[in-house]
């Protein structure tokens, strides 16, 4: 167990031109707050996927009113750290999302309004117990500077917070085979209490005799890497050789969701859908009011003036969930016809149509040949959203306006001479060669390399190429 700590240092205009306008004004004073969402491993940073490692909301910053005419400075920040406790081992690699929210303090009906100013995301490697890591992230014209670290809660120590420490029994040194616990040099590593043989790198335990696996490892001793490719059953065959997840209790067995939350399995773990008034990985956090700003992505919070009455988040278009935390994937309904590309812009859906199709949903098939004339007797052929001309002999180009020079490509081999002909080209072959393009040598005895020359044509005669 341990705590991930995040310190925001500054949020303001980034370097370079195009400084953003101040988010607050004399008419609409506002204050900032931050939300951090953590996910284990180098998982997708999609804002709507659950914060499986945990999430935290900062306090509100000081009220800020823009000075007219002044550029947006670094905005005043909330005091203190954002702390995300983690119960199990620290995964070492994690993804984060940090959102900067603005709370407008004007005369809004129904209380303050929240809007998302900036969202930054990243994937990082971080060992617990190390120094503060510093980071700069840019979101549009805004720049966010922050530090973060993961620290273990005693008695846990180590880069994954999986080793345990106990006070020394003897004043001078630790027992046989046990090291002092840095940074608690006056303590000693606790004797191993995990199941015998439990992998020290990939397994850990919280109770004597157990062996729980870090993400990506399985087996009774956490020595088998998880392979997701060769598993046949929903949780994989029970086989130590394939390295698949062993069938057995699913992540939702025993319902880990508290306070009436409902559990659903995800590819990696589980997700709790919490009843109103509760949130957190396992719906364990309660007593939320609208003052805590529980509605994300611009959702409007109504009710919930005191911890005993539930609040309701009214979500803006494109978001759902009890806290508006889930983005609606409106493109999954495949609204774009005829192979059009769906773009969810948040405020609206757009279809980018393939050539030859139009309309809000690419439902109109354009007549490619309408109004397209092919010159010199060419005929228009429709296809693939673009018109094409099939040209009469002797003509070429997109609209058959160019007179084709059949000899331009030097089609006659072995020094044959090319003559343009109304129906194509004719090759006059050099002595010793024959064929439509003079490609065949004539054998010294008069026989050709082909079967016989066509009747009526002697070797060496000009060959007409149709």
């Amino acid at each position: 167990a341990g705590v991930f700590e995040l310190q925001i240092h500054s949020f303001g205009p980034g370097p370079g031109p195009g400084a953003p306008r101040s988010p607050c004004s004399a008419r609409l004073p506002c204050r900032l707050f931050f939300r951090v969402c953590l996910k284990p491993g180098l998982s997708e940073e999609a804002a709507e996927s659950p914060c499986a490692l945990g999430a935290a909301l900062s306090a509100r910053g000081p009220v800020y009113t823009e000075q007219p005419g002044a550029p947006a400075p670094d905005l005043p920040l909330p005091d203190g750290l954002l702390q995300v406790p983690f119960r199990d081992a620290w995964p070492g690699t994690f993804s984060f999302i940090i959102e900067t929210w603005r709370e407008e303090l004007g005369d809004q009906i129904g209380g303050p309004a929240w809007s998302l100013l900036a969202r930054v995301a990243g994937r990082r490697r971080l060992a617990a117990g190390g120094p503060w890591a510093r980071d700069i992230q840019r979101a549009g014209a805004w720049e966010l500077r922050f530090s973060y670290r993961a620290r273990c809660e005693p008695p846990a120590v180590g880069t994954a917070c999986t080793r345990l420490c106990r006070p020394r029994s003897a004043p001078s040194r630790c027992g046989p085979g046990l090291r002092p616990c840095a940074p608690l040099e006056d303590e000693c590593e606790a004797p191993l209490v995990c199941r015998a043989g439990c992998s020290p790198e990939h397994g850990f335990c919280e109770q004597p005799g157990e062996c729980r696996c870090l993400e990506g490892w399985t087996g009774p001793l956490c020595t088998v890497p998880v392979s997701t490719s060769s598993c046949l059953s929903p949780r994989g065959p029970s086989s130590a050789t394939t390295g698949c997840l062993v069938p057995g209790p699913g992540p939702c067995d025993g319902n880990p969701c508290a306070n009436g939350g409902s559990c659903s399995e995800t590819p990696r773990s589980f997700e709790c859908t919490c009843p109103r008034g509760f949130y957190g990985l396992r719906c364990e956090v309660s007593g939320v009011t609208c003052a805590d700003g529980p509605c994300f992505n611009g959702g409007l919070c109504v009710g919930g003036a005191d911890p005993d009455s539930a609040y309701i988040c009214h979500c803006p278009p494109g978001f759902q969930g009890s806290n508006c935390e889930k983005r609606v994937d409106r493109c999954s309904l495949q609204p774009c016809r005829n192979g059009g590309l769906c773009l969810d812009l948040g405020h609206a859906l757009r279809c980018r149509c393939r050539a030859g199709f139009a309309g809000p949903r690419c439902e109109h098939d354009l007549d490619d040949c309408a109004g397209r004339a092919c010159a010199n007797g060419g005929t228009c052929v429709e296809g693939g959203g673009a018109h094409r001309c099939s040209c009469a002999l002797g003509f070429g180009g997109r609209d058959c306006r160019e007179r084709a020079d059949p000899c331009a490509a030097r089609p006659c081999a072995h020094g044959g001479r090319c003559y343009a002909h109304f129906s194509g080209l004719v090759c006059a072959c050099a002595p010793g060669y024959m064929g439509a393009r003079c490609e065949f040598p004539v054998h010294p005895d008069g026989a050709s390399a082909l079967p016989a020359a066509p009747p009526g044509l002697r070797p060496g005669d000009p060959q007409r190429y149709l």
Partner: antibody, heavy 122, light 107 residues
Amino acid sequence: QVQLVQSGAEVKRPGASVKVSCKASGYTFTGYYMHWVRQAPGQGLEWMGWIDPNSGDTNYAQKFQGRVTMTRDTSISTAYMEVNRLRSDDTAVYYCARDPNRRSWYYGMDVWAQGTTVTVSS
Amino acid sequence: DIQMTQSPSSLSASVGDRVTITCQASQDIRNYLNWYQQKPGKAPKLLIYDASNLETGVPSRFSGSGSGTDFTFTISTLQPEDIATYYCQHYDNLPLTFGGGTKVEIR
């Protein structure tokens, strides 16, 4: 007390490599970044990069990328800095220095070792 | 990279004098500035961080000020043991860069 002690002076030929060590004591080695800074004779200070002893992550100044390697051995609380393909202009005093690990936006050096003189000469 | 320009490069002053050194950054570095003292043949020593905060154990005659691009380091009453070269160093971003140094001598 908090202390950093570096290895002794080195004389090297151009094209050779040198590896300087920096032993930490009096504090938790893995809890603080270690910077490396050099100073050519009669010149100013030049930052070379840092290493996070906890994870082994490094960040090098562009000028030294590909030619400098920073490593550590946590079991003996020692950081190392190796410079390859030495040139005469690498002649300098090389310092390791601890970053104070402030929570604020900060990079600096609050504890310095005595320095290691590296002379590159044919 | 951010350039740090220190001036003067050297100065001579009498014991008891007020000494001022300036450091200019090539771009806005907020208050992300350190000042170090290096005595001949020794390693540098951190005196001031965050442009104006005195490091623990450093005498109060040393002070720093400034923000953005222009910074000042002051020794209010020069002492004989202050003979050294003084460097500024920014930490707005990586790479960290130092000023060229100011050598302070006793007249």
